[in-house]
């Protein structure tokens, strides 16, 4: 019986140019992950297998860091970054966990737009 | 539980549209997950078509996307597959499937054959 | 596109057989592996994904390993109603790709 829940980070904003860590935490249950997939709906960003330790998608190698711990850090956010993200638990003898985290990336703030193009 | 069932012509000419419609039961298509057209020509292997999200986003294969469309009705909790100028290539039976989020496929339509001949 | 290269494409076997069907990847797919079957006439059931993970209520008969390109999927002890089909595919990237197929036949 799965008794486990995932809490996320939500939905989380960030600016475009910058970064974000993506984190799942699976807590209620006494069982072993043993692998964590990070995957958007139509593609795998990374994997971390408690044996064979991680694997970064290579679409994305350039611009996501394992970690901290189980997460994932987006770096160089674009808004085509902008979507779902899910974190899928595998565990035993549970079986598998996901949690969802919605990414929203903005363009630099209004006030940084103005002062680049300002005048003296 | 989730249940997939696919409606459509069994007989399609050369040249026309292939529709074809699958109808969810138990899950509303609106709530969560993709929900996919994969195919599977007599005697061969599979084919994964594409996808349309609960959100409504798609998806589809590079090299079937010129005739493909996947679109829904979420007023009928269905979704559909249009595919146009087919051949006697494009004869297989068509499955409808739900993915979970990692990409691989619990739940499936039992399958219907669609023949393209004159 | 990653093309599932699966081996033997047919093999004859006898109940309480132990089976061994082998997948591999055009490149790494780490361990993003499913294992279907698939009877005459019925739409695939889902075994095995991520490469060993058993899905819900399948037999402990079945069971899947490897990373990287090479997959292995298992029947320890093959019963009656095992003489069917079976695929890999990968889900790693889009277009999600299957194996051409093995054919479990009656010795």
């Known amino acids: 019986m799965m008794t486990g829940t995932i809490e996320t980070t939500g939905n989380i904003s960030a600016e475009k140019g910058g970064s974000i860590i993506l984190q799942c935490h699976l807590s209620s249950t006494t069982a072993q992950v043993t692998q964590v997939n990070w995957e958007q709906q139509d593609q795998l960003l990374a994997i971390c297998n408690a044996d064979l330790g991680w694997h970064i998608s290579p679409s994305f190698k350039d611009r996501v860091a394992p970690g901290p711990g189980l997460g994932l850090t987006l770096q160089s956010l674009t808004v085509n970054d902008t979507g779902e993200y899910f974190c899928i638990y595998h565990t035993y003898p549970d079986g598998t966990y996901t949690g969802r985290i919605f990414l929203e990336v903005l363009e630099s703030s209004v006030a940084e737009h103005g002062a680049r193009f300002q005048i003296p | 539980q989730v249940q997939l069932q696919e409606s459509g012509p069994g007989l399609v000419k050369p040249s026309q549209t292939l529709s074809l419609t699958c109808t969810v039961s138990?899950?509303?298509?609106?709530?969560?997950?993709?929900w996919n057209w994969i195919r599977q020509p007599p005697g061969k292997g599979l084919e994964w078509i594409g996808y349309?999200?609960?959100?409504?986003?798609?998806r589809y294969n590079p090299s079937l996307k010129s005739r493909v469309t996947i679109s829904r009705d979420t007023s009928k909790n269905q979704f559909s597959l249009k595919f146009s100028s087919v051949t006697a290539a494009d004869t297989a039976v068509y499955y409808c499937?739900?993915?979970?989020?990692?990409?691989?496929?619990?739940?499936w339509g039992q399958g219907t054959l669609v023949t393209v001949s004159s | 596109d990653i093309q599932m290269t699966q081996s033997p494409s047919s093999l004859s076997t006898s109940v309480g057989d132990r089976v061994t069907i082998t997948c591999k990847a055009s490149?790494?797919?780490?361990?993003?592996v499913a294992w279907y079957q698939q009877k005459p006439g019925k739409a695939p059931k889902l075994l095995i994904y991520?490469?060993?993970y058993r899905y819900t209520g399948v037999p402990s008969r079945f069971s899947g390993s490897g990373s990287g390109t090479d997959f292995t999927f298992t029947i320890s002890s093959l019963q009656p109603e095992d003489f069917a089909t079976y695929y890999c595919?990968?889900?790693?990237?889009?277009?999600?790709?299957f194996g051409q197929g093995t054919r479990l036949e009656i010795k």
């Open positions: 138990g899950y509303s298509i609106t709530s969560d997950y993709a």
């Open positions: 991520s490469a060993s």
């Open positions: 490149q790494d797919v780490f361990t993003a």
């Open positions: 595919q990968q889900h790693y990237s889009t277009p999600w790709t």
């Open positions: 349309i999200s609960y959100s409504g986003n798609t």
């Open positions: 499937s739900r993915k979970y989020y990692g990409s691989w496929f619990p739940y």
